[in-house]
Interface confidence: low
């Protein structure tokens, strides 16, 4: 069956729903699970055969203001001898997340949801070879 | 990031913090980017630490479909196509923000929720603990 989108539902609307002006939605930005922690293996970004660095991007008109982006350190992958092997490729793994964007229009402030593509880390892949006919 | 200067004629009500509750436009910017990782790349098959993608569906959430990665092997695939257990396939996890319908089933009322997803896998050198 069709997956309901934001603003559309196949559920019966309960009486307790807050009134919302047309064309907009109410968003509580007090985050559920705010204090949960990522329990990733230690230092995987430097132990990986496709290592990466982290860069923090900061924007005061975005919520959350800090978004961490990964960047692959090499184009190739690190082999057993610790050297870059360019017969393999380090590639970014990306994931979408939502942010709230604050926009100033004259004296009024409006808020917009935005999908942001975050690079999470890198993985080592066998390259696709295009053979010329 | 740049703070956009306000019109000097505006009342001085600039708040650097976001309010707890905001009214947001129903149209999500960049909404139509491809959310199916199987369609966007085949890294999950070509990686030396390949993974399977599992569909996680929740109609009370936006986006309602999230793909979770699960590493196929404990080790990594070597040049001969065999699993090398001297290396480890590990998941790369990321906290993302989604919308949770609150109160439940309401069409236009949401709360931000932080969830942890495994996005893919990477091949790492294992941490070896030597017994004294």
């Amino acid at each position: 069956r069709k997956i309901p989108k934001v603003g559309h539902t196949f559920f019966q609307k309960p009486e307790s729903c807050p009134p919302v002006p047309g064309g907009s939605m109410k968003l509580d930005i007090g985050i559920i699970n705010e204090n949960q922690r990522v329990s990733m293996s230690r230092n995987i970004e430097s132990r990986s055969t496709s290592p990466w660095n982290y860069t923090v991007t900061w924007d005061p008109n975005r919520y959350p203001s800090e978004v961490v982006q990964a960047q692959c350190r090499n184009l190739g992958c690190i082999n057993a001898q610790g050297k870059e092997d360019i017969s393999m490729n380090s590639v970014p793994i990306q994931q979408e997340t939502l942010v709230v964007r604050r926009k100033h229009q004259g004296c009024s402030v409006s808020f917009q949801l935005e999908k942001v593509l975050v690079t999470v880390g890198c993985t080592c892949v066998t390259p696709v070879i295009h053979h010329v006919q | 990031g740049i703070t956009i200067p306000r019109n000097p004629g505006c009342p001085n009500s600039e708040d650097k913090n976001f309010p707890r509750t905001v009214m947001v436009n129903l149209n999500i910017h960049n909404r139509n980017t491809n959310t199916n990782p199987k369609r966007s790349s085949d890294y999950y098959n070509r990686s030396t630490s390949p993974w399977n993608l599992h569909r996680n569906e929740d109609p009370e959430r936006y986006p309602s479909v999230i793909w979770e990665a699960k590493c196929r092997h404990l080790g990594c695939i070597n040049a001969d196509g065999n699993v090398d257990y001297h290396m480890n396939s590990v998941p790369i996890q990321q906290e993302i923000l989604v919308l949770r319908r609150e109160p439940p089933h309401c069409p236009n009322s949401f709360r931000l929720e932080k969830i942890l997803v495994s996005v893919g896998c990477t091949c790492v050198t294992p941490i070896v603990h030597h017994v004294a």
Epitope: N53, T55, Q71, R73, G76, P127 | -
Partner: antibody
Framework: EVQLLESGGGVVQPGRSLRLSCAAS????????MHWVRQAPGKGLEWVAV????????YYADSVKGRFTISRDNSKNTLYLEMNSLRPEDTAVYYC?????????????????WGQGTTVTVSS | QSGLTQPPSASGTPGQTVSISCSGS????????VNWYQQVPGAAPKLLMY???QRPSGVPDRFSVSQSGTSASLAISGLQSEDEADYYC???????????FGSGTKVTVLG
């Protein structure tokens, strides 16, 4: 907007010194490796030097080794090129350029942002 | 003496495909990926391609690259008048311990 602005060029006599500066803005300068590249009038591009994001590693072209020194002040978002014992063949437009990815990169992602250049003329 | 060799010039009419070769050695192209730069007269160089055929944003997909052994090439398909510029290949050279540029190729759009 990411910008690099070179300064310090001018006319100088052979054997003298000059210090070029490159002011960076619009990005986290301390995260990126930086290069100097020069171009003699009517000639091609010639690489001069590179410095790692934290200043710990420096590499030079053979033609300037021992005479030029690349350095950076991350607190001032500024890259420098100290040029000593200048020769007529050092006459060129000098560009500073940013490495295209943060961290331990020197070249893999290319030089993605360039300044407009500053002209150095070595003549008696 | 540049470590990377390019033809001094190449030309084509609008819509045609032009290829520029870049020849090196094991210590540079043989070991590292090649970057390509475009420089229009009077302006600073601009990064055109890097890595394994990756394009910075804003660079049209008419530009493509290939790399094999100790040589690389840049192809410009559907040639346009704004493609008239100097093109440089560049990469790291292990022997020199530094970045090295090709000698440059001037592309002329005829007609």
């Amino acid at each position: 907007e990411v910008q690099l602005l070179e300064s310090g060029g001018g006319v100088v006599q052979p054997g003298r010194s000059l210090r070029l500066s490159c002011a960076a803005s619009g990005f986290i300068f301390s995260n990126y490796g930086m290069h100097w590249v020069r171009q003699a009038p009517g000639k091609g591009l010639e690489w001069v030097a590179v410095i790692s994001y934290d200043g710990s590693n420096k590499y030079y072209a053979d033609s300037v080794k021992g005479r030029f020194t690349i350095s950076r002040d991350n607190s001032k978002n500024t890259l420098y090129l100290e040029m000593n014992s200048l020769r007529p063949e050092d006459t060129a437009v000098y560009y500073c350029a940013k490495v295209g990815a943060s961290g331990d990169y020197y070249y893999s992602y290319g030089l993605d942002v360039w300044g407009q250049g500053t002209t150095v003329t070595v003549s008696s | 003496q540049s470590g990377l060799t390019q033809p001094p010039s190449a030309s084509g009419t609008p819509g045609q495909t032009v290829s520029i070769s870049c020849s090196g050695s094991n210590s540079n192209i043989g070991s590292h990926s090649v970057n390509w730069y475009q420089q229009v007269p009077g302006a600073a160089p601009k990064l055109l391609m890097y890595g394994i055929g990756q394009r910075p944003s804003g660079v049209p997909d008419r530009f493509s690259v290939s790399q094999s052994g100790t040589s690389a090439s840049l192809a410009i398909s559907g040639l346009q008048s704004e493609d008239e510029a100097d093109y440089y290949c560049a990469t790291w050279d292990d022997s020199l311990g530094g970045y090295v540029f090709g000698s440059g190729t001037k592309v002329t759009v005829l007609g």
